[in-house]
């Protein structure tokens, strides 16, 4: 996360680190004792479940036990819109035990469409600079807002690449954004409860003023999530 402050896992108990061969690859969000929500592109290189592990319950990357993964379910790839459908569900081998530092985040209600300038939060262990060095060892957080998709698709920005199944978030002047290593983590909105409204997906650089972060819009995939759950009951 670029333009940030340190976070405590008490504040974001649904945040997990998704690791391959003990290396942090992506963030993710706990939805219930069995399921973690993340981005499909995290698994482009490796889809085998055996070397993937989930770490929950700590704000420090290396300091918490790893959980075995039973299944990785990725939505169908759409070659017409290769950046669309960047969503995946990980089923854990054993259910999580919830505590002060391990808790689920809510899915949005089906009519939750957020207006531009709505305040949101991002978190992650990703790079803190665009051309950036390394992952952060500690969980970082930042406040952003919904950026109007018309503005996001402007000629000096993403030129129409942001589809209706995506959303943009950042701050108008830039400087606050998700970055490499934050992928799969939640874009969060607080109403009565915290909701995961977006999944860290893609962007050009990190923190540029005209190219904010682009997120998978979770409300666009509720049906897919519910169908996966139903099929896995």
């Amino acid at each position: 996360v670029v333009g940030v402050e340190e976070a405590s896992v008490d504040s974001w108990p649904w945040q997990v680190s998704i690791q391959y061969d003990k290396q942090h690859v992506c963030g993710g969000s706990i939805l219930d004792p069995h399921w973690v929500l993340t981005a499909a592109h995290c698994f482009r290189k490796h889809t085998d479940v055996f070397n993937w592990k989930v770490r929950a319950g700590s704000d420090k990357l290396g300091s918490f036990p790893s959980l075995a993964v039973a299944k990785i379910i990725i939505i169908e790839f759409n070659p017409m819109y290769p950046k669309d459908n960047d969503i995946a569900l990980m089923k854990l081998q054993f259910p999580l035990t919830f505590s002060g530092t391990v808790r689920p985040i809510c899915l949005p209600f089906f009519d939750e469409e957020l207006t531009p300038a709505t305040p949101l939060w991002i978190i992650g262990w990703g790079f803190t600079k665009q051309n950036g060095g390394k992952m952060s060892d500690i969980l970082l957080q930042a406040s952003v807002q919904v950026i109007d998709s018309t503005r996001c698709n402007a000629d000096d920005a993403y030129q129409g690449e942001v589809t209706e199944k995506m959303m943009c978030a950042g701050i108008p002047e830039g400087g606050v954004d998700t970055c490499q290593g934050d992928s799969g983590g939640p874009l969060m909105y607080q109403s009565d409860q915290w909701h995961v409204v977006g999944i860290v997906s893609w962007g050009y650089g990190c923190g540029g003023p005209s190219t904010p972060g682009v997120y998978t819009k979770v409300s666009a995939y509720l049906n897919w999530i519910y169908n996966v759950w139903k099929a896995e009951l």
């Epitope: 689920p104 809510c106 899915l107 949005p108 209600f109 089906f110 009519d111 939750e112 469409e113 207006t115 209706e164 199944k165 109403s191 009565d192 409860q193 909701h195 819009k217 409300s219 666009a220 995939y221 509720l222 049906n223 897919w224 519910y226």
Partner: antibody, heavy 115, light 112 residues
Amino acid sequence: QVQLVESGGGLVQPGGSLRLSCAASGFTFSSYAMSWVRQAPGKGLEWVSAITGSGGSTFYADSVKGRFTISRDNSKNMLYLQMNSLRAEDTAVYYCARGGNLDVWGLGTTVTVSS
Amino acid sequence: DIVMTQTPLSSPVTLGQPASISCRSSQSLVHSNGNTYLTWLQQRPGQPPRLLIYKISKRFSGVPDRFSGSGAGTDFTLKISRVEAEDVGVYYCMQLTQFPLTFGGGTKVEIK
């Protein structure tokens, strides 16, 4: 003012198809999920289908799954219901309704499936 | 699917008197986000339905304050404190917590 106007209803034979439209005005259409609800003659209300504001997620009642398709065109402020393989039991007044609370309704359009 | 059961089927009321309609769901309507998406709709004869109450007890804009909603979990009630002639029609409860969305069978309010 906020308004929903349905059209496209009519008489169709069993097995036939029909496409209903709902024109929305007076609000930011893309910010709202939309639903279709139907009411058979002399009967209660039955939810048919819903679609999220982006059009990304669609939901259906079991009675219409695989036969009906909900869609929307946010650039035109239009909601659609494509109805295929129509049956006599699909005969009803079809309403479109706004949002997760169904807070605005159209006047409805009548679909009659009969030979 | 969540089954919504309304009672009574019909409620003959004297003008100016209260009326009460009950709605019971086959499972809890509390969404994972903590909200309870239970709405009440009114359908006057020959008209489309109209939203009265959402999230158990919130009155929709323009709805007279003689209408009130209450309840929690699986048991909900719509009350009309003093029935007026324009209140005649069928009242439906509906849950929007879980797909498929489902309605109660309706309660007909008529004047004695």
